[in-house]
Amino acid sequence: EICGPGIDIRNDYQQLKRLENCTVIEGYLHILLISKAEDYRSYRFPKLTVITEYLLLFRVAGLESLGDLFPNLTVIRGWKLFYNYALVIFEMTNLKDIGLYNLRNITRGAIRIEKNADLCYLSTVDWSLILDAVSNNYIVGNKPPKECGDLCPGTMEEKPMCEKTTINNEYNYRCWTTNRCQKMCPSTCGKRACTENNECCHPECLGSCSAPDNDTACVACRHYYYAGVCVPACPPNTYRFEGWRCVDRDFCANILSAESSDSEGFVIHDGECMQECPSGFIRNGSQSMYCIPCEGPCPKVCEEEKKTKTIDSVTSAQMLQGCTIFKGNLLINIRRGNNIASELENFMGLIEVVTGYVKIRHSHALVSLSFLKNLRLILGEEQLEGNYSFYVLDNQNLQQLWDWDHRNLTIKAGKMYFAFNPKLCVSEIYRMEEVTGTKGRQSKGDINTRNNGERASCESDVLHFTSTTTSKNRIIITWHRYRPPDYRDLISFTVYYKEAPFKNVTEYDGQDACGSNSWNMVDVDLPPNKDVEPGILLHGLKPWTQYAVYVKAVTLTMVENDHIRGAKSEILYIRTNASVPSIPLDVLSASNSSSQLIVKWNPPSLPNGNLSYYIVRWQRQPQDGYLYRHNYCSKDKIPIRKYADGTIDIEEVTENPKTEVCGGEKGPCCACPKTEAEKQAEKEEAEYRKVFENFLHNSIFVPRPE
């Protein structure tokens, strides 16, 4: 029986009965928030072998082991993960061991086992046999291993039953509980699973099988399951579903959903049956089951019940995320805000069409309207009094409408109105008239030439760069000395620069009037010598990185009510020189024979140039013979048992701590103070723990129904 799509068992332990007939949970399994300690011994679900997403256990009182509940759970596929994890065991107060002795494979994702005060048998499980990579596993705040005294079956009788593997240079027995070994397949099977009798399964099997070399006898499938057989790919006219099985078109068409978007049903795309077309695709017709690529962003129509949507904060803008067509009117009234330009772009940047009017008033936080970076059509189906469909009033810091060299905007019906925008040059408004096709519609008073641009240097001369020099982390630039009619009007220059992977930036990107600016700014004083060209050394830059740079002359903007000329350069794109790359990441080595090592790594995070080759060096190491830590048969070696409280803390230090030796002398002394790097790592670790815990709480706590 397939159960799903995800099972959430909470508050009442008797809900576990829902798992009675499940062999596969198509989705996740949550068991959580059962605060009354119960006796779980009567609950056993031997049929359950596979969970396709993840297993989450959180605050289940009285549960001491998972082995009795799920004796045959073999595979957790991790098709969807819980915060990157396929197995989460968090704050399980009474859990003494995991005990999932048949768990052989976690296909994707890592494990997180945290704050389980009584949990032992963690150091005896070799997770590398179950997961591909153990580096992302997070196992902290459980019972300290030295207080556990974990013994694998037969160890006390000196007839050990379990096999040994090496973890962190410790060669030891591997087991789940005091009477259950961790199963390992013979090396002859390679990556293949094996039966209980150590015979190799068919290559398409995952976890285990009931008969050797038989693709119909698998407990779970490595790739896909179809009609009782494990197959490497779905046969013709069948489609992948939930990452583990193949279904036909009829099956896909008949999946019913409780999502609000279900009116059109599931779709088939790229050989997969899925709930919705993936990003960048749209249904080929309203009742179609197939997807086609969108031309540009996929259309999403948003409508405002009250006809006019007021954008007065980031929160109100958030409602428009992903919208490409807005049915109604936009009233933008942004007086203040933090990082407002980039936030607005994030939430409104996809809007292409507004069916009504656009009104921007008292938006003192705005420097530019470029956050509406895809707006191409204002229909003007509804207009303001006076037949205005684009209305811009009293925006004290507005300097730019759009970058008209890269923008086509049409206003289909209605007029434009501009007044009391002191930093907005009239030439910018006239340019908009031409681009939008509204020239001739406006009457004389609609564009006020006195109070628009009155506090801006509107007639701009062009500053020309004269030289550029680069090194790996520096750029030196010089430009022509600007000479306004009266030299006293020139105060200084400001150089603006920022990283620009693509040559598509504009002066107003990410800039608002509340201090946020994606550009770095440096002031450059005038050289005292009139013949010396002004210039600057930009340092602390990244190697092999393209930067955009422009320069502006800082001038007195008004001289007895006459507009005076300003000056600025075009945007210059310049790349720093290459440098030595950072170290390659995630280096892993494994031996696949007595004379070979396979070494894998990921590229460096900072290539600092075009990588052409890697150098691999190796050397022989002496073998570590120090294999055993504790002799459990010797009484004085067994640590004093103390109940762990499940908090993550520095281990208590006994009276005479023999910690790492400071300085040259041997003998007991204080632990060395932590380095800045260690303190920083601890801080990041604590932060990461908090983020995860918040994610957990936000995901699982739901309001009580009214």
């Epitope: 397939i2 159960c3 799509p5 829902r18 279900d262 129904p705």
Partner: nanobody, 123 residues
């Protein structure tokens, strides 16, 4: 936890009609796919019909297609099954079931079940 209570069952003659209701309480009703199943005496429980959360899409077993109509009223938290042209083989206990998020055609293990209401078709 979701509680489901069926009603509307009874004795009806062949060719007659009956309307079953299922009242739900406890969670947001529209976030569940709802289904009707039935179990005739001495037989396995079988699927009858299902409806999506919004009520826009339905699915029926071949044996009831054209005769039964499933519907839901999310404002009243109620599921309905309108049964027309009833036959003797429709005699069974009818169960209402709810599953969160979605339901595949092969899903029989629904999350929540009602106690059932008996429908007897006999002359």
């Amino acid at each position: 936890e979701v509680q489901l209570v069926e009603s509307g069952g009874g004795l009806v003659q062949p060719g007659g009609s009956l309307r079953l209701s299922c009242a739900a309480s406890g969670r947001t009703f529209s976030s569940f796919v709802m289904s009707w199943f039935r179990q005739a005496p001495g037989k396995e429980r079988e699927f009858v019909s299902a409806i999506s959360g919004s009520g826009s899409r339905m699915r029926y077993a071949d044996s009831v297609k054209g005769r039964f109509t499933i519907s839901r009223d999310n404002s009243k938290n109620t599921l309905y099954l309108q049964m027309n042209s009833l036959r003797a083989e429709d005699t069974a206990v009818y169960y209402c079931a709810a599953n969160p998020r979605r339901a595949t055609p092969d899903l029989t293990q629904y999350a929540y079940w009602g106690q059932g209401t008996l429908v007897t078709v006999s002359s």
